[in-house]
């Protein structure tokens, strides 16, 4: 269903357009498969406008649907490593409200050091993303080779 | 920050919309890594609005944030051909002006025949894009296996 | 070329945003390659605004320039499965009208199991787009493994 | 709902083949797929194939692959698994399943499949 005709009639800034780009701050301590992440201008080309960071996960400000795009990297890989070490798999997904949880993006590292992948998905002011690397093996921080972000693309 | 309330006001036209999709034109000499990119409606279903190419590589015509994409795949290959090739790397970056030089998104040809990922990121009016290709393979020409484009975002 | 200024004063709802992204149903019986989608809030986080299915196919509403992306990842999949059955090929294209056929997108599993991609291309009211999957592997039909979706960006 | 009833275990000798045979009944229009799990003493339930319900497509654990063969009967709305070449570690029970309902995954790879039999018993002596 279109949105009403009175809302798109307003300023843009009032429809959205929040935008997030995301560098690997560190991993979570054992037990914890989290990923944090950090943003911002002082740290080179992540930002952060209108979605936050809570504790190193990614909260969002406005509901919407929202492209949702990672690339995660293996440090020191080979594709040995990586099957030596399957199942090592990243999944991104909505862990709060709990109500709200769900796994919204799964790939799993098989003989390759590199996963990449998008998605279109409804998100809704306060859900926070979560991204779950299982196994043991480390993820770059390069900021070329992992990064994680979101895109408002419409109401 | 939010953009100046005037400057929503305005037609869309004069708040962007800059997109480009190329497909491979050739690769450089030897010691050149460069991917030289061509599009145009000619050509089949690349195209340029806003952006330019410069012997090849693509400048940006307007400041913004950009949603980078990439795909590339390996010609006449095999998962045995990509991982006795190895490392056979893409790297998108700024590579002019010099001072702006910075690598943006980079993946390996591990034991795959095709790398594909996409990144937000910042990018001014007057950065070029290239997309170095490490290695000896040579990458298909099909527009349906390789292409490179971005898209504006936001202010 | 930027579209006409009378255009652009017209209310956000003329400008499209059309968007679609779908979950998948079934694989087509033998000798069909195509992948069959399905898309809805009660199926859970899939939608169709603007863009409709037809026999499981997705059909374009707006002309326009979108960004195509999918994921597809292959059921009960290891490296050795995907290599064992080589070659496993996903392709998205326009595949009606017949006129405008065309191969848009395409990959292959080599050693891996999932294979992800976006590109950005020019569709028109009518055209319907079919994602074949070549050879005898079941694609999983978990919503965070296998999905398809478009996104309407500019005129 | 379905209805899922597991027929064709029993005792064989390492080497040896058997061929178990589900009976599927009741409304199939949502079904995407059926697969064959097993699950041996002490052990999690693991799954060993599985076969598209409106085609030929076909997938299976790395431990089975060129041993085991899935495959539909349509006429009959029978799924079977042949099993040649059995092992000691083939042993457990094997259920037959049907995969009706979307979700998204979890580590459990018998999320999905929300349709049971009630399962056959396969020995492999040694």
């Known amino acids: 269903q279109r949105f009403a005709q009175a809302q798109q009639q307003l300023p843009l800034e009032s429809l959205g357009w929040d935008v997030a780009e995301l560098q690997l701050n560190h991993t979570g301590p054992q037990q914890d498969p989290r990923l944090y992440w950090q943003g911002g201008p002082a740290l080179g080309r992540s930002f952060l406008h209108g979605p936050e960071l809570d504790k190193g996960q990614l909260r969002i400000h406005r509901d919407g649907i929202y492209m949702v795009h990672i690339q995660v990297t293996l440090a020191i890989c080979s594709s040995t490593t990586a099957s030596r070490h399957h199942p090592t798999t990243l999944a991104v997904g909505i862990c709060s409200p709990a109500s709200r949880s769900i796994s919204l993006l799964r790939l799993s590292f098989h003989q390759g050091c590199t996963i990449a992948s998008q998605r279109l998905t409804p998100l809704a002011r306060g859900d926070t993303l979560c991204t779950n690397l299982t196994g043991t093996l480390l993820p770059s921080r390069n900021t070329d080779e992992t990064f994680f972000g979101v895109q408002w693309v419409r109401p | 920050q939010r953009f100046a309330q005037a400057q929503q006001q305005l037609p869309l036209e004069s708040l962007g919309w800059d997109v480009a999709e190329l497909q491979l034109n050739h690769t450089g000499p030897q010691q050149d890594p460069r991917l030289y990119w061509q599009g145009g409606p000619a050509l089949g279903r690349s195209f340029l609005h806003g952006p330019e190419l410069d012997k090849g590589q693509l400048r940006i015509h307007r400041d913004g944030i950009y949603m980078v994409h990439i795909q590339v795949t390996l010609a006449i290959c095999s998962s045995t051909t990509a991982s006795r090739h190895h490392p056979t790397t893409l790297a998108v970056g700024i590579c002019s002006p010099a001072s702006r030089s910075i690598s943006l998104l980079r993946l390996s040809f591990h034991q795959g025949c095709t790398i594909a990922s996409q990144r937000l990121t910042p990018l001014a009016r007057g950065d070029t894009l290239c997309t170095n290709l490490t290695g000896t393979l040579l990458p298909s020409r099909n527009t349906d296996e390789t292409f490179f484009g971005v898209q504006w975002v936001r202010p | 070329q930027r579209f006409a200024q009378a255009q652009q004063q017209l209310p956000l709802e003329s400008l499209g945003w059309d968007v679609a992204e779908l979950q998948l149903n079934h694989t087509g019986p033998q000798q069909d390659p195509r992948l069959y989608w399905q898309g809805g809030p009660a199926l859970g986080r899939s939608f169709l605004h603007g863009p409709e299915l037809d026999k499981g196919q997705l059909r374009i509403h707006r002309d326009g320039i979108y960004m195509v992306h999918i994921q597809v990842t292959l059921a009960i999949c290891s490296s050795t499965t995907a290599s064992r059955h080589h070659p496993t090929t996903l392709a998205v294209g326009i595949c009606s009208p017949a006129s405008r056929s065309i191969s848009l997108l395409r990959l292959s599993f080599h050693q891996g199991c999932t294979i992800a991609s976006q590109r950005l291309t020019p569709l028109a009211r009518g055209d319907t787009l079919c994602t074949n999957l070549t050879g005898t592997l079941l694609p999983s039909r978990n919503t965070d493994e296998t999905f398809f979706g478009v996104q309407w960006v500019r005129p | 709902q379905l209805q899922l009833v597991e027929s064709g275990g029993g005792l064989v000798q390492a080497g040896g083949s058997l061929r178990l045979s589900c009976a599927v009944s009741?409304?199939?229009?949502?079904?995407?797929?059926m697969a064959w799990f097993r699950q041996a003493p002490g052990k999690e339930r693991e799954i060993v194939a599985v076969?598209?319900?409106?085609?030929?497509?076909?997938a299976y654990a790395d431990s089975v692959k060129g041993r085991f063969t899935i495959a539909k009967d349509n006429a009959k709305n029978t799924v079977s698994l042949q099993m040649n070449s059995l092992k000691p570690e083939d042993t457990g029970v094997y259920y037959c399943?049907?995969?009706?309902?979307?979700?998204?995954?979890?580590?459990?790879?018998?999320?999905?499949?929300?349709?049971w039999g009630q399962g056959t018993l396969v020995t492999v002596s040694s």
């Open positions: 009741g409304r199939t229009s949502s079904t995407y797929a």
């Open positions: 076969i598209g319900w409106s085609g030929g497509r076909t």
């Open positions: 399943a049907a995969d009706s309902e979307q979700s998204s995954s979890s580590e459990g790879q018998a999320y999905g499949y929300e349709d």
